[in-house]
Each structure stands twice: as structure tokens, then as C-alpha cells.
Amino acid sequence: PGPPAGSPRVSSDPRADLDSAVLLTRSLLADTRQLAAQMRDKFPADGDHNLDSLPTLAMSAGTLGSLQLPGVLTRLRVDLMSYFRHVQWLRRAAGPSLKTLEPELGALQARLERLLRRLQLLMSRLALPQAAPDQPAVPLGPPASAWGSIRAAHAILGGLHLTLDWAVRGLLLLKTRL
């Protein structure tokens, strides 16, 4: 008999589910890299850009060895939800300049949403708790200027690129441990 009604269905092959998540993450990483390059081309970045509201990078070379699947998936989902909100904010608030990249930003947001749904599904199949973010999402304030919003766009795409890069590495490493 299958699992009792109401309990999450544990996938017969979590590695296949993880493979699918890795593929989506890789695809999103490629989109982000391409859009970041377009941004640099259209709106040259003068140095590195930060945005206080962005999540801090969860993984580094030093932490790869100690990764655990529940922690990685939970943190990745929380961070990507934050990036999803930031991309949404960019599309609505950043001014006419970024409207020239509207199709690409719209596609990026849609793919981010798809990856978030995939991660949620993976977590439920692995019977992992669907953790909520540690603190409620801080409302994103209006950009001080068009130039400020372009700097924010550079920061968001740069941060998302790094996060996805580490996510691919982390998920591939975890797959070998399943």
C-alpha cells in the first residue's frame, strides 16, 4: 500500500528529481549570465554593486564539504524567493531604461518561479519541512534615481548569478550522497 493519505509522497527516485532541479538551475544560470552581460553592454557597470536587501551568499568553497540536503534546499528556496521579489520589483519600479530589457526580465522571473515550484515539489517528495523565511520580507523601497535602479539591477543579477552557480555545485555534490 502507498503512504497514508495526507503524508507527502516520497519519490521512488529522488536523484531523478534532483537531476531535474539541477537542469532547471543550470538553465536559469545561463539566462542570468546572458542578461547580466546584456546589462553590462547596455548600462556599463562602474565597479561592484551591492544591495542591502539581497540575501548573503549561503555557500562557499569552504562549506561545500559539510552541506546537508535539507539545509541546502531550504536556504536555496528562501534566497531564490528573495531574488524573485527583487526581479519583480525591478520590472515595476526601475524606470524606462530597464523596459528595454522587459522581455528578458519577464522570462527570467517566470523561470525563477518555475525553479521555486520545482524546489518546493522536491522538498515535499523528500518529506522535508517547507520552512518559511526567517524574517518577513522587507518591502523594497523606491529607487532614488534611474542610475540607482540600474546599479540595483547589476547587483541583483550579479547576486543571482553567484547564488545559482553555487546551487548547481551544491546540488550536484548532494546528488552523489543520495
Epitope: P143, S145, A146, S149
Partner: antibody, heavy 117, light 111 residues
Framework: QVQLVESGGGVVQPGRSLRLSCAAS????????MHWVRQAPGKGLEWVAV????????FYADSVKGRFTISRDNSKNTLYLQMNSLRAEDTAVYYC??????????WGQGTLVTVSS | QSVLTQPPSASGTPGQRVTISCSGS????????VSWYQQLPGTAPKLLIY???LRPSGVPDRFSGSKSGTSASLAISGLRSEDEADYYC???????????FGGGTKLTVLG
Amino acid sequence: QVQLVESGGGVVQPGRSLRLSCAASGFTFSHYDMHWVRQAPGKGLEWVAVISYHGSVKFYADSVKGRFTISRDNSKNTLYLQMNSLRAEDTAVYYCARTPGFHFDYWGQGTLVTVSS
Amino acid sequence: QSVLTQPPSASGTPGQRVTISCSGSSSNIGSNYVSWYQQLPGTAPKLLIYYDDLRPSGVPDRFSGSKSGTSASLAISGLRSEDEADYYCSAWDDSLSGVVFGGGTKLTVLG
């Protein structure tokens, strides 16, 4: 404090040209997208055009596309609107406005353009 | 005809609460932020509300903005005689690639 001062308005015959200027002060002009908005006598506000902070992205209202050109000179803190092939329906007060995103936080006092034969 | 639809006029007595509506579509209000402007007779417009519901510093908290779906509203409570003006809503329109305005609402303070 932020100041936007339009100039260049006047009476012009249909089919002729006119160039409006907007001198900006009190803020870092090169950090802001800038718009032109017009208002015909006794009518509502009508958006005309926008130019990005760096000058390479421009959008125009359908009613002026192909006739009006928006430009800026960040070294002179000045916004321009070159108006060609003017029509009677272009008669309006023209305002320049600063925008941090999609809202206009500062407006000039306006300059009146009258197209009449 | 304006892309955003506002009632041409509205009125109220001092102290009253008045609401001005602004109706649009998915390509403007539905997917972008709404701003509101007040234009006193013979003067340039002044920003009242931006980002749907934020007030710039200096604008009294009697003015408030809200948005639901493809419609937005400006509410003015504790109406005063100096609030008599034209009010305009505005948003970016993704289909037109430009800013769109409502036709404006002339607010009259009675008595």
C-alpha cells in the same frame, strides 16, 4: 533645491520647428531619467517623451513619434525637445519633469507653445 | 480619450472624505505602479502619491492611495478648501511603451 526651468516656447506657424530647453539644477542631472509632458489649454496632462539618464534609451508618445526628438546634454545639465512639423494640436504648455522611476517627483513651471497661422 | 479612466468631477464639503477612482488595464495599472498628481489652478502638477500608496515628504497624511487589480484610488480625508484642484492618476503602459495619464478629476470643495 531641485529646479527645472523650461524655455524656448512661443508662437510658431504650422509645419515649422521649435526647440525647447529645460535647465536643471540642485541635483545630479546625469542620474535621472527625464520626461516632457504637455497640457493643451483647458485640457488634461499628456505624456510626450522620456530619455534615460545616459541618453541612449528614448520613448515617445504615438502623437509625436517621428516629429519630436528628445535629447540631453549631461555636461550642461540640460534637457531638450526638438519639435518639427508642428501642428495646431501641439499647442500646449510643455513641462519637463524628473523621474526616479515612473513617477514625476519634480516639474518645471512650463513653457507655452502656440502653433497658429 | 485617455487610457486611464477617471470621473471628470468630484465634490465634497469641508471635513468630508472624498475618493477619486482611476481605472486601467493589465498593461498599465495591473503591472506597474500608479502615481497621483495635484494641479492647482495656473500651476504645474505636484506629486501626491507614488508607488501606489507612498506619500512624498511634505504631503499631508490626509491623502492616501490604494490599488487593486487594474484600478487605483486616491482618498482625501478631512477635506479642505485648498484641496480644490485637478487630480490626475498615471502609470507606465507596457503595451504603449510610455506613460499614460487619466483624464483628470476636478475636485470642488462645497460651502
